[in-house]
């Protein structure tokens, strides 16, 4: 599960482990569960009291190249009458994911793992009220 | 794989797509150093669709710890602080990529894995099915 830092001695690995040069790791980017589909409730982004839109970010030097980001549509939340209630706040919910970055240095290519913060959707919260003395 | 623009001066033999297996530097770059200041640790309590967080551990996965959300109620919290069952709390789920040790227990050989995590909850209007 855990990745040792560069330049440190590695655990005496089982014979079945592939040989890997120091300071790097072998990564198979054929994704396990590639065809798994999200079974989220239908169009919750539109039915939510804190609705959001999706935009697709594209980066050809990233794997996967497509990352979907959500943006809250409103500052406030949608009330029962379908109107925006600014006494409540729509706020983004975020989650970290890993991507592989491809870097070109001259004609040579290297690969780097990267943590990317993805906005997944929005939720409606009661605001924090700061009382000024 | 995905197509990569390449330096026109480089040999043509270079593959334009991501290869199936790559050697990756062990140091992970963090794109999130300037974390969004709106990212708050108390949304789970202040939301009208509050959730609890559960610590999911998997020794063969990187990251080894992922926090998962579970909605506290079927309904949503109204202005009076009561659960309103005319609305529904639903999980916001996201597919994320993690690393899975492959073969198992190997210290520096991994495969990408797509997993589904519940990140938080949101309050939605229910879908009403009218029976004829």
């Amino acid at each position: 599960r855990k990745i040792p830092k560069v330049g440190h001695t590695f655990f005496q690995k089982p014979e079945s482990c592939p040989p890997v040069p120091g300071g790097s790791m072998k990564l198979d980017i054929g994704i396990i569960n590639e065809n798994q589909r999200v079974s989220m409730s239908r169009n919750i982004e539109s039915r939510s009291t804190s609705p959001w839109n999706y935009t697709v970010t594209w980066d050809p030097n990233r794997y996967p190249s497509e990352v979907v980001q959500a943006q809250c549509r409103n500052l406030g939340c949608i009330n029962a009458q379908g109107k925006e209630d600014i006494s409540m706040n729509s706020v983004p919910i975020q989650q970290e994911t890993l991507v592989v970055r491809r870097k070109h240095q001259g004609c040579s290519v290297s690969f780097q793992l990267e943590k990317v913060l993805v906005t997944v959707g929005c939720t409606c919260v009661t605001p924090v009220i700061h009382h000024v003395q | 794989g995905i197509t990569i623009p390449r330096n026109p001066g480089c040999p043509n033999s270079e593959d334009k797509n991501f290869p199936r297996t790559v050697m990756v530097n062990l140091n992970i770059h963090n794109r999130n150093t300037n974390t969004n200041p709106k990212r708050s640790s108390d949304y789970y309590n202040r939301s009208t669709s509050p959730w609890n967080l559960h610590r999911n551990e998997d020794p063969e996965r990187y990251p080894s710890v992922i926090w998962e959300a579970k909605c506290r109620h079927l309904g949503c919290i109204n202005a009076d602080g009561n659960v309103d069952y005319h609305m529904n709390s639903v999980p916001i789920q996201q597919e994320i990529l993690v690393l899975r040790r492959e073969p198992p227990h190997c210290p520096n050989s991994f495969r990408l894995e797509k997993i589904l995590v519940s990140v938080g909850c949101t309050c939605v209007t229910p879908i009403v099915h009218h029976v004829a």
Epitope: I3, F11 | Y44, P63, S64
Partner: antibody, heavy 119, light 107 residues
Framework: EVQLVQSGAEVKKPGASVKVSCKAS????????FHWVRQAPGQGLEWMGV????????AYNQNFRDRVTITADKSTSTAYMELSSLRSEDTAVYYC????????????WGQGTLVTVSS | DIQMTQSPSSLSASVGDRVTITCKAS??????VGWFQQKPGKSPKLLIY???NRYTGVPSRFSGSGSGTDFTFTISSLQPEDFATYFC?????????FGQGTKLEIK
């Protein structure tokens, strides 16, 4: 430089509560978990629980579940551990420790806070 | 809970000696074991993580090995500053548990 600075020693009566703080500096507070571990005099270390300041999630050792509460204040980059219904066997040094959730190990520890429970 | 049984509980040695401490887990913990040094009145200091990886700045005389249930920590040539208590810890699954410690004293 990463630092975890804990609050000072406390003397408490049985049945009382104690709240120990751990102030972090030198890194982004919300990026890593905070764990609390205690060490009774002459004894080994005992894990009490964890908080992730980034999302507010907590998990506790069942042995302490009903008595311990771990919180975090992002505005001051401080984690807290409150232990209630104190008894004499809770006399111990209490440590906070930073845990790297990706890599999966404790790298930095606070200097410890001695809590003495005595009537 | 996973038990970590550490031995010996105390050990007398001289400067220059090679010292070995063992830790046995009650069930497999893969390579998810760390070794810490603690001096009186001080907090634990990480020496080894993931069974065999030296933490940043830790001298090369400290090493660790093992996987599954059996783990070993070695100081190849004791220095005066190494006299302290050492303990192992598993972070394979919570509740995370620790060995009882080995007190290393000057002979």
């Amino acid at each position: 430089e990463v630092q975890l600075v804990q609050s000072g020693a406390e003397v408490k009566k049985p049945g009382a509560s104690v709240k120990v703080s751990c102030k972090a500096s030198g890194y982004t507070f919300t990026d890593y978990e905070f764990h609390w571990v205690r060490q009774a005099p002459g004894q080994g270390l005992e894990w009490m629980g964890v908080i992730h300041p980034g999302n507010g999630g907590t998990a506790y050792n069942q042995n302490f579940r009903d008595r311990v509460t771990i919180t975090a204040d992002k505005s001051t980059s401080t984690a807290y551990m409150e232990l209630s219904s104190l008894r004499s066997e809770d006399t111990a040094v209490y440590y906070c420790a930073r845990f790297l959730t990706y890599e999966g190990y404790f790298d930095y520890w606070g200097q410890g806070t001695l809590v003495t429970v005595s009537s | 809970d996973i038990q970590m049984t550490q031995s010996p509980s105390s050990l007398s040695a001289s400067v220059g000696d090679r010292v070995t401490i063992t830790c046995k887990a009650s069930q497999s913990v893969s390579i998810d074991v760390g070794w810490f040094q603690q001096k009186p009145g001080k907090s634990p200091k990480l020496l080894i993580y993931h069974a065999s990886n030296r933490y940043t700045g830790v001298p090369s005389r400290f090493s660790g090995s093992g996987s599954g249930t059996d783990f070993t920590f070695t100081i190849s040539s004791l220095q005066p500053e190494d006299f302290a208590t050492y303990f192992c810890q598993q972070d394979y699954s919570s509740p995370y548990t620790f060995g009882q410690g080995t007190k290393l004293e000057i002979k």
